[in-house]
Interface confidence: low
């Protein structure tokens, strides 16, 4: 129903803690280079007005959209062109235009520092200090990290590191309690970050309807017993919390997906029984539980999907009637049967039967025409199985490091004119996939392998479509979502490319690596390794393995050393003449 | 490198049966699905049966209920089973593995239906 003040309808329904949370994400997404304090004041001005509102629906300026708000908010900070360049642009334009110029502008690989974690006594002291503020840090950092975070997620996510410090602060040994658990947050927040980038990028690029199809094929995989007029309702719904978190509208995404959750758990007969344990928690831990529960049990009854989809005389005419219908039928059929499959595999093969419906309804005798479009899915089906299969088997005989940097040679050769720290960060990310995944039982490791390296490719295309350098990435990056893993999956090596002349300097190392953390170290062997790869970009597996492992050889003695620096003076160049060797 | 050897096919009349059979060699056979096809002079290859790694099968819609498709990972063979056989069933069949990752098909063995 339509509100007096859209600001105080918000501010009702989320309470003050939630609206005060989503409005500093937003803000922080909004403009990525502005302090906490400044967004602090921000928001504070924003909610003391919201307050106004709720006093008095008629008050001055209560009857205006959020994005006039927000809008006329952010465009009255001090220095905005010196600071944000262009995008104070944005700020001549009029609603809805405006909006709009702010989402185009927000930066995926904004430069700022990566987010350092204080050490525990510093952390708990100042978390006891101001519990409030502290926990503000945490959503503006994160957020203006990661510009399309989903909010309420996010707000979930608050909530657990909030916990965490409450309970390990309280601890003698603060630092052996809060690490692992921060770790498991970060590592959970990273990947629900890339998942919901993909999701806007489908949004943005391919339109509500692609979105809602990605929707249909995970719903109907997690609730095979629910209908497909059920399953259309929960898609549509959730499509539209999406859209509007990937436009910045965060007051309405968190309210219409609380709305959503609370729909669910009213509903649990028709949708699934493995709601209740999620239904019991408070809303921020039901709404996420419920995004990731497991799959209910399939019905033992399902009919061969052939059936409807083949083997009935009127499939041309359901299809012509109806065609998305039909295809949505399809993909929820097909999917409740398959919770073993990937989202990106089930459109695939949605989209399989769509071009082979438009074809062959053309034809004189369609039936046999149609007829072999499930033995047609196979080689689309096999694909990736065996892709899951070759690096599961990789990963378990490498371990995660060395798999990253198989992942890292193969990239390198594969698109050798992206960026050394992109590719690296690719690299790692992708290599990830085998902790995540390939430890899972059998039907649980492709959905998992694959969905989770689309998110992880989307992410190189965001980055490679700020400066194209590789007409292979150019290429993936170009075609739908669902095919681009495949895509990059069958690049080979870039015949193009012209390889990189040998630098001494990028292989010149200085004792102060010795004292970084691991994951630095590995990050500045892995930039090493690409940098080879670009030199030689037909180099063999055992020629870079000669040269990592004696890389990695000179590190721990140099690193041993009494004296140090002279051991990396003298040894390093040693190093860079065997290098040359090896490669030669 | 990888090979395929097709064998079974020959001359038999209508409503009459054979056993084809095809051994893989040169690539890890149980974790593809295999494919058997059917050439006619002057047409397109076309998918008779498929079977997955894990031995689920699919069918063509003239081969439905009449044709079995079934395999062995320890002797890396596929089989085809074909019953009650019509002159349109006629054509080299061949099988090969259902994979992008490399393209590769046999020989072919020749049935003709026949009266």
């Known amino acids: 129903e339509a509100h007096k003040s859209e600001i105080a309808h918000r501010y009702n329904d989320l309470g003050e803690q939630h609206f005060k949370g989503l409005v500093l994400i937003a803000f922080s997404q909004y403009l990525q280079k502005c302090s906490y304090d400044e967004h602090a004041k921000l928001v504070q001005e924003v909610t003391d007005f919201a307050k106004t509102c709720v006093a008095d629906e008629s008050a001055a300026n209560c009857d205006k959209s959020l994005h006039t708000l927000f809008g006329d908010k952010l465009c009255a900070i001090p220095n905005l062109r010196e600071n944000y360049g262009e995008l104070a642009d944005c700020c001549t334009k009029q609603e809805p235009e405006r909006n709009e110029c702010f989402l185009q502008h927000k930066d995926d690989n904004p430069s700022l520092p990566p987010f350092e974690r204080p050490e525990a006594e510093a952390m708990c002291t100042s978390f006891k200090e101001n519990p409030t503020t502290f926990m503000g840090h945490y959503l503006h950092e994160v957020a203006r990290r990661h510009p399309y975070f989903y909010a309420p997620e996010l707000l979930y996510y608050a909530e657990q590191y909030n916990e965490i410090l409450t309970q390990c602060c309280a601890e003698a040994d603060k630092e052996s309690c809060l690490t692992p658990k921060l770790d498991g947050v970060k590592e959970k927040a990273l990947v629900s970050s890339v998942r919901q980038r993909m999701k806007c990028s489908s949004m943005q690029k391919f339109g509500e309807r692609a979105f809602k199809a990605w929707a249909v094929a995970r719903l109907s995989q997690t609730f095979p017993n629910a209908d497909f007029a059920e399953i259309t309702k929960l898609a549509t719904d959730l499509t539209k919390v999406n859209k509007e978190c990937c436009h910045g509208d965060l007051l309405e995404c968190a309210d219409d997906r609380a709305e959503l959750a609370k729909y669910m758990c009213e509903n649990q007969a028709t949708i699934s029984s493995k709601l209740q344990t999620c239904c019991d928690k408070p809303l921020l831990k039901k709404a996420h539980c419920l995004s990731e529960v497991e799959h209910d049990t399939m019905p033992a009854d399902l009919p061969a999907i052939a059936a409807d989809f083949v083997e009935d005389q009127e499939v041309c005419k359901n299809y012509a009637e109806a065609k998305d219908v039909f295809l949505g039928t399809f993909l929820y059929e097909y999917s409740r049967r398959h919770p073993d499959y990937s989202v990106s595999l089930l459109l695939r093969l949605a989209k399989k039967y769509e071009a082979t419906l438009e074809k062959c309804c053309a034809e004189a005798n369609p039936p046999a025409c149609y007829g072999t479009v499930l033995a047609e899915f196979q080689p689309l089906v096999e694909e990736p199985k065996n892709l899951v299969k070759t690096n599961c088997d990789l990963y378990e005989k490498l371990g995660e490091y060395g798999f990253q940097n198989a992942i890292l040679v193969r990239y390198t050769q594969k698109a050798p004119q992206v960026s050394t720290p992109t590719l690296v960060e690719a690299a790692r990310n992708l290599g990830r996939v085998g902790t995540k995944c390939c430890t899972l039982p059998e039907d649980q490791r492709l959905p998992c392998v694959e969905d989770y390296l689309s998110a992880i490719l989307n992410r190189v295309c965001l980055l490679h479509e700020k400066t194209p350098v590789s007409e292979h990435v150019t290429k993936c990056c170009s075609g739908s979502l669902v095919e681009r893993r495949p895509c990059f999956s069958a690049l080979t090596v870039d015949e193009t490319y012209v390889p990189k002349e040998f630098k001494a300097e990028t292989f010149t190392f200085h004792s102060d690596i010795c004292t970084l953390p691991e994951k630095e170290k590995q990050i500045k062997k892995q930039t090493a390794l690409a940098e080879l790869v670009k030199h030689k970009p037909k180099a063999t597996a055992e020629q870079l393995k000669t040269v990592m492992d004696d890389f990695a050889q000179f590190l721990d003695t140099c690193c041993k050393a009494a004296d140090k620096d002279t051991c990396f003076s003298t040894e390093g160049p040693n190093l860079v003449t065997r290098c040359k060797d090896a490669l030669a | 490198q990888v090979q395929l050897q097709e064998s079974g096919g020959g001359l038999v009349q209508p409503g009459g049966s054979l056993r084809l059979s095809c051994k893989a060699s040169g690539f890890t056979f149980s974790i593809y699905s295999m494919g058997w096809y059917r050439q006619v002079p002057g047409k397109e290859r076309e998918a008779v049966a498929t079977i997955s790694s894990g031995g689920s099968p699919f069918y063509a819609n003239s081969a439905s209920g009449r044709f079995t498709i079934s395999r062995d990972n320890a002797k890396s063979t596929v089989y085809l089973q074909m019953n009650n056989l019509k002159p349109e069933d006629t054509g080299v069949y061949s099988c090969?593995?259902?994979?992008?990752?490399?393209?590769?098909q046999g020989q072919g063995t020749q049935v003709t239906v026949s009266s």
């Open positions: 090969s593995p259902i994979t992008s990752i490399f393209k590769a």
